[in-house]
């Protein structure tokens, strides 16, 4: 009796269990009572990453430099190309179809985590005792200058955006 289900890496067609094509190959013809499934390797710049019965291979992803993209890993007949972003840019999605410039942390904020090709800069507010007076994608919050260690006194208190201003001690005191 004709099968109703087939083994792994097989598919049912015309009451026959036919072998699927291996990754990197596409289906040319189904098996028959007298012949095997016929498969052909994917062409240049094409891939199929699963056991399949596809009659067309998928095109490798194009890493468009106009969108800030570059090739991180070249595709094979069994894998797609992996794109990443040029230096200073990061992907806008997991699929990495386009890039945006890394965010800078404004004055009063420092870099908690430097951006990568796939993640943006993470900023954090400078806590008490720290400051950042620049807009930067790399600079962390810096600690206020310690006037005491320089035998100086605080003349102007620091903020999250400014360092303390130190000055000489009052000699009259």
């Amino acid at each position: 009796e004709p099968p109703t289900a087939c083994r792994e890496k097989q598919y049912l067609i015309n009451s026959q269990c036919c072998s699927l094509c291996q990754p990197g190959q596409k289906l040319v013809s189904d098996c028959t009572e007298f012949t095997e499934t016929e498969c052909l390797p994917c062409g240049e710049s094409e891939f199929l990453d699963t056991w399949n019965r596809e009659t067309h291979c998928h095109q490798h992803k194009y890493c468009d430099p106009n969108l800030g993209l570059r090739v991180q890993q070249k595709g094979t007949s069994e894998t797609d190309t992996i794109c990443t972003c040029e230096e200073g840019w990061h992907c806008t999605s997991e699929a990495c179809e386009s890039c945006v410039l890394h965010r800078s942390c404004s004055p009063g904020f420092g870099v908690k985590q430097i951006a990568t090709g796939v993640s943006d800069t993470i900023c954090e507010p400078c806590p008490v005792g720290f400051f950042s007076n620049v807009s930067s994608a790399f600079e962390k919050c810096h600690p206020w200058t310690s006037c005491e260690t320089k035998d100086l006194v605080v003349q102007q208190a620091g903020t999250n955006k400014t360092d303390v201003v130190c000055g000489p001690q009052d000699r009259l005191r």
């Epitope: 072998s19 040319v28 013809s29 189904d30 028959t32 009572e33 007298f34 012949t35 095997e36």
Partner: antibody
Amino acid sequence: EVQLQESGPGLVKPSQSLSLTCSVTGYSITTNYYWNWIRQFPGNKLEWMGYIKYDGSNNYNPSLKNRISITRDTSKNQFFLKLNSVTTEDTATYYCARLDYWGQGTSVTVSS
Amino acid sequence: DIVLTQSPLSLPVSLGDQASISCRSSQSLENSNGNTFLNWFLQKPGQSPQLLIYKVSNRFSGVLDRFSGTGSGTDFTLTISRVEAEDLGVYFCLQVTHVPFTFGSGTKLEIK
């Protein structure tokens, strides 16, 4: 339903060429399957002669050396057998077949 | 070429009896994918061969379950569980694993 029908001359002179046509209905010969020519000699012995595949490629029985050619006309859904330099040894019933379906056969006698 | 040896050449049976036909190959018919393309055909008097069993044990559509095929490698058997008058004729095995395809010499099933 798939049907195959052979046609061609029933008598061929020695040293001449034997040409047969197989007309297929109910299935396109370009879709799938191997389209075979098989002959049956007096006394029932069957011999596979060769096939033309759905994609137009061929395979022949080496015993027929360079005498055999199988071609097709996809617009008419027909395939053809040509056997050159025939002798009386080529007298047989000739079948075209997809193997799960066969033509009714055509008898060919080689005689002067 | 693969040689298929069928036995017996003639098989006299009584209606209702079981009949078994053997087909032995000169080399294994299992291909690299683990498939074995050994087929059985019945040729009734005055007719073309008709497919009964493909790939050793699969009944072709419309074939009654009285017909069954078994075997592997080089040794194959066709069994008819209860012979009926319409089963009479010549049975052939055919291998299509290796080119050239080759047939067995045939077994004539007849009434005792």
